[in-house]
């Protein structure tokens, strides 16, 4: 599963340019006076994506984000000056960075921002119905944002607004030291975690908050916070980070004497995401970056997807781990972590645990405790001194479902879509990175549905410049993905079946659960459609089984074979470029001598060097002339991509061309020129670097001389010039548009 083989590379890799050209990305490149498009709120009902940014809140149309409304919500000049005088950066810190954006009720949103290190909140009217088209700030009513938004824009807030109450994990002070989980708004007194107690929270960084029911009784509902924090001394030797899941009961109103206006049901457990390493030492991915909850039929048991990175600066890696809520609950019902003093190791608590068990929500379900204020002193005391569980939560199958350690990027965000395919449901992950790319990954069962293998379908660059993806939302209704970064917002479809190709096999090889071969094209798969007409194989991506009745080999279904003629010079080198669209495909070359039917496999050696981009033929001989066939082989299916006819020009021929008197009739040049076809392409740079002819310093010199004569001939015979010039122009364009593997910095042939 972790081998960095072909399965670990994206099958398709699309640059930003390619995404734009194929209309697969829509970007909002931000406003000149804004940035930090990090806070997302998806409203499928109104078909809007609300985005909180620097001094602005946006309302984007989910169909097309180019259509948007905006609210400007800056801070006053006074506030900005106070912030500046406090030694903060006027551009990066002394502004109103929106950190909280939540649905408050049917008609309003609740928004909070840093307010230039003076957190502030207000309500935003959005109307009852989508057609109301209302989007306005309630500027007559501002509230203190302390305990809701951080002061510092660099810090995140994890928040959740339910039943008019805001749960938020954030820093509650100017210095960014007093981190807490708060409940504010509503009619009750604000509640928070215990202050100045590192056993509860130790310099945490909050990721997200989610309401998850515990039973069918809403009194048992819990709010779960995901965060990372410094490991407490004794938990780990040296400074380390731990990923955490924390729980609190929705109906926690604090204690009656101890923990007054503090959570009495707060518990936390470590989330493990690691792989076994050499010497029995596990490699841990501890820096939790993002969490996504995939809802199941049972609302009590969503699947938790977590994105993690390594803490090490030397070894950079990312992983995705999946957790089940039953495992989480099992840990919260297990032993509490206990130690007798700061110099002692943490051990599982062996003593008597008070009743009701700390962390249990007061309800009719569990013993009739009406409120946390009714809990006996021993429960509160125990809860105060034992906020952490001893056992960690291990991922499903005890290992990550995906890791990446061999790349120059790290994962930052994740959203997951559950897709109905021909043979069951598949979870498709969209993973954001710190270089502005999105990975599309599908979890495919190997032998069983429990043993998953990750198939990396695509790597898409969604922003022009490399930028950290800091927010992602997925609209199942619109079948679109929305991505946020400092630079702006991007929108892309969840599926683009047509990009896979025009043949059944190509569609099948793609292994995209969204797509299937419908008999004539690769298109969106709908489970309701007639099954017999749909071809799909997500599990194995085997076209031989699923498409064999349609095509036994290749090129039968609209796949036009590209043909080219290339001229090489004897004793020099030439490059035959061929790179399949799929990075998973293996390239297989065959050679066919002139006037022969027999094809032979090309043997690589000193004379022929194989590169990722194609074949490099060194020290060309006349016998190298012939047809070169480039095939892509993937999962047993072979497709011919290209037929290159190589003509090797002998040295004598070349000498004639070079040393012929300028006034000569140029017949040889004419012969060479006229034999070229529009699909030709000469790789001049490879010639320049590798040619070694006694009378020729560079291929450029050769070309210059050919062109000089050609120009002379055109002057002498004006009627001939047009065709030749167009011929070369076509070649130039065909080079530009050929495919992503062609290095953009390589010089194309100059027009003749």
């Amino acid at each position: 599963n972790y081998a960095n083989g072909k399965n670990n590379v994206p099958r398709l890799k699309l640059s930003y340019k390619e995404m734009l050209e194929s209309n697969n990305v829509i970007t909002f490149n931000g406003l000149a006076n804004s940035s930090s498009y990090h806070t997302f709120l998806l409203d499928e009902e109104r078909s809007r994506l609300y985005v909180g940014a620097k001094d602005h809140i946006f309302s984007f149309n989910l169909v097309n984000i180019k259509d948007f409304q905006k609210i400007v919500w800056p801070v006053s000049y006074t506030r900005r000056d106070e912030c500046k005088w406090a030694g903060k950066d006027i551009l990066k810190e002394c502004a109103n960075f929106i950190k909280v954006l939540k649905a408050y009720n049917q008609t309003h949103l609740y928004a909070c921002g840093t307010g230039a290190f003076h957190p502030i909140c207000t309500y935003i009217e959005v109307g009852h119905h989508p057609e109301d088209n209302i989007f306005k700030l309630q500027d007559s009513h501002f509230e203190n944002g302390r305990g809701k938004s951080p002061y510092d824009p660099k810090l995140l807030t994890a928040s959740l607004l339910i039943d008019g109450e805001l749960y938020s994990g954030t820093a509650a002070d100017f210095m960014g030291r007093d981190f807490a989980i708060f409940r504010t708004l509503g009619h009750h007194h604000p509640i928070r975690t215990e202050q100045h107690d590192s056993r509860w929270l130790n310099d945490p960084r909050f990721i997200s908050a989610h309401l998850i029911p515990e039973s069918d009784n809403p009194e048992d509902d819990k709010v779960y916070f995901f965060f990372r924090e410094n490991a407490i001394d004794g938990e780990h030797s040296g400074k380390a980070t731990h990923a955490r899941i924390g729980q609190i009961c929705k109906n926690d109103f604090g204690g009656h004497r101890s923990l007054v206006n503090k959570w009495t049901t707060f518990l936390k457990a470590r989330l493990i995401c690691s792989v076994p390493g050499p010497n029995g030492i596990d490699t841990h991915f501890d820096e939790l970056q993002d969490v996504f909850l995939m809802n199941s039929k049972d609302p009590k048991n969503p699947i938790v997807y977590g994105v993690f990175t390594t803490s090490s600066n030397i070894f950079k890696g990312s992983a995705v781990c999946m957790y089940s809520m039953s495992d989480v609950r099992r840990v919260f019902l297990g032993p509490y972590a206990h130690r007798d003093g700061p110099n002692y190791q943490w051990v599982p608590y062996q003593g008597r645990v008070p009743y009701p068990r700390p962390g249990t929500c007061p309800s009719k379900t569990f013993g009739g405790f009406d409120s946390t204020k009714d809990l006996p002193d021993d429960v509160i005391t125990f809860a105060r001194s034992h906020p952490a569980m001893y056992n960690p939560v291990f991922p499903i199958n005890n290992r990550p479902i995906m890791i990446k350690t061999d790349v120059n990027y790290q994962f930052t965000q994740i959203v997951v879509d559950r897709v109905d395919a021909e043979d069951g449901q598949y979870d498709v992950m969209f993973i954001g990175t710190d270089v502005g790319t999105v990975l599309k990954v599908v979890s495919v069962p190997k032998e069983t549905w429990h043993d998953l293998e990750e198939v990396l379908l695509e790597e898409m660059t969604v922003f022009r410049e490399p930028t950290t993806i800091s927010a992602m939302e997925l609209s199942t209704k619109q079948q679109q993905l929305y991505i946020g970064s400092t630079a702006g917002v991007a929108q892309l479809p969840l599926h683009r079946c047509d990009i896979y190709g025009k043949a059944c096999a190509e569609c099948c090889l793609a292994r995209d659960p969204y797509c299937a071969w419908d008999g004539s094209s690769c298109s969106r798969y709908f489970p309701t459609a007639k099954r017999r007409t749909r071809r799909q194989d997500i599990r194995n991506g085997d076209p031989l089984t699923h498409c064999s009745d349609l095509q036994h080999h290749d090129n039968h279904h609209g796949h036009s074979l590209e043909e080219r003629i290339i001229y090489g010079v004897e004793n020099s080198s030439t490059f035959l470029e061929c790179s399949p669209k799929s990075q998973r495909a293996l390239v297989y070359w065959q050679f066919q001598r002139r006037n022969e039917d027999r094809k032979e496999e090309i043997r690589v050696g000193d004379h022929i060097i194989r590169t990722e981009q194609g074949l490099l033929l060194r020290s060309l001989q006349k016998k190298d002339s012939g047809n070169y066939l480039c095939h892509a082989v993937e999962h047993g299916f072979m497709q011919t991509l290209l037929k290159v006819t190589l003509e090797v020009i002998d040295t004598e021929h070349l000498e004639e061309l070079l040393h012929k008197d300028d006034d000569g009739d140029g017949s040889k040049t004419k012969e060479m020129s006229s034999s070229m076809t529009p699909s030709q392409k000469v790789w001049y740079r490879d010639f320049m670097q590798l040619i070694n002819h006694p009378n020729l310093n560079t291929m450029d010199e050769f070309c210059e001389q050919v062109w000089k004569r050609d120009r002379k001939q055109r002057r002498q015979r004006p009627g001939h010039s047009q065709g030749s010039s167009n011929k070369w122009k076509h070649m130039q364009e065909s080079k530009k548009g050929r495919n992503r593997r062609t290095h953009e910095f390589e010089r194309a042939p100059r027009s003749v």
Epitope: H256, D370, D374, P376
Partner: antibody
Framework: EVQLVESGGGLVQPGGSLRLSCAAS????????MSWVRQAPGKGLEWVST????????YYPDSVKDRFTISRDNSKNTLYLQMSSLRAEDTAVYYC??????????WGQGTTVTVSS | EIVLTQSPATLSLSPGERATLSCRAS??????LHWYQQKPGQAPRLLIK???QSISGIPARFSGSGSGTDFTLTITSLEPEDFAVYYC?????????FGGGTKLEIK
């Protein structure tokens, strides 16, 4: 004024049963934990049982567990202690007490239970 | 269970004198300790809650201190009505337990 009045004490044979009652007044009964504490003749105090506000859960020491049952009727402002399988060592004055979540702030005058053959 | 040990078992003092009663817990109980006074033929009465919190209606001469395992009840100037038995009780964890009592008698 807070008042707690116990009743139901008396003489009972070993193995027998008895039900004590405590009528509460002067405070919102359903807002407090309630407890029973006993004192054997010439001895110290011993906690017997505590019931939470709703009546949904109760606590007991090992010495009376499975033999004594505390209950309450919030609509009648009354606390009960059902005692069965009584032993000679259960002979004591039984006090009805307000509290048990924290300190026990109000005590009744007590009712005497004598277990003897 | 948590065992509370009171000392001395009996304390003989004269009115006007200062009384210092001790209660020691077998394990740390924070400040979850309460003091009661019981006179012959009467029910106990709460004097101090949570180690040091005074109770309304209780004279100011009664005060409590301590936390963890060692606690003290102090009566600054004894009055004739103060001669009684004093009990400490822990509310830290079930089962709740009482100390054996200290009998304060007139010398």
């Amino acid at each position: 004024e807070v008042q707690l009045v116990e009743s139901g004490g008396g003489l009972v044979q070993p193995g027998g049963s008895l039900r004590l009652s405590c009528a509460a007044s002067g405070f919102t009964f359903s807002s407090y934990y309630m407890s029973w504490v006993r004192q054997a003749p010439g001895k110290g105090l011993e906690w017997v049982s505590t019931i939470i506000k709703s009546g949904g859960y109760a606590y007991y020491p090992d010495s009376v567990k499975d033999r004594f049952t505390i209950s309450r009727d919030n609509s009648k402002n009354t606390l009960y202690l059902q005692m069965s399988s009584l032993r000679a060592e259960d002979t004591a004055v039984y006090y009805c007490v307000r509290g048990g979540q924290g300190a026990m702030d109000y005590w009744g005058q007590g009712t005497t239970v004598t277990v003897s053959s | 269970e948590i065992v509370l040990t009171q000392s001395p078992a009996t304390l003989s003092l004269s009115p006007g004198e200062r009384a210092t009663l001790s209660c020691r817990a077998s394990q740390s109980i924070g400040d979850y300790l309460h003091w009661y006074q019981q006179k012959p033929g009467q029910a106990p009465r709460l004097l101090i809650k949570y180690a040091s919190q005074s109770i309304s209606g209780i004279p100011a001469r009664f005060s409590g201190s301590g936390s963890g395992t060692d606690f003290t009840l102090t009566i600054t100037s004894l009055e004739p009505e103060d001669f009684a038995v004093y009990y400490c009780q822990q509310g830290y964890s079930f089962p709740y337990t009482f100390g054996g009592g200290t009998k304060l008698e007139i010398k």
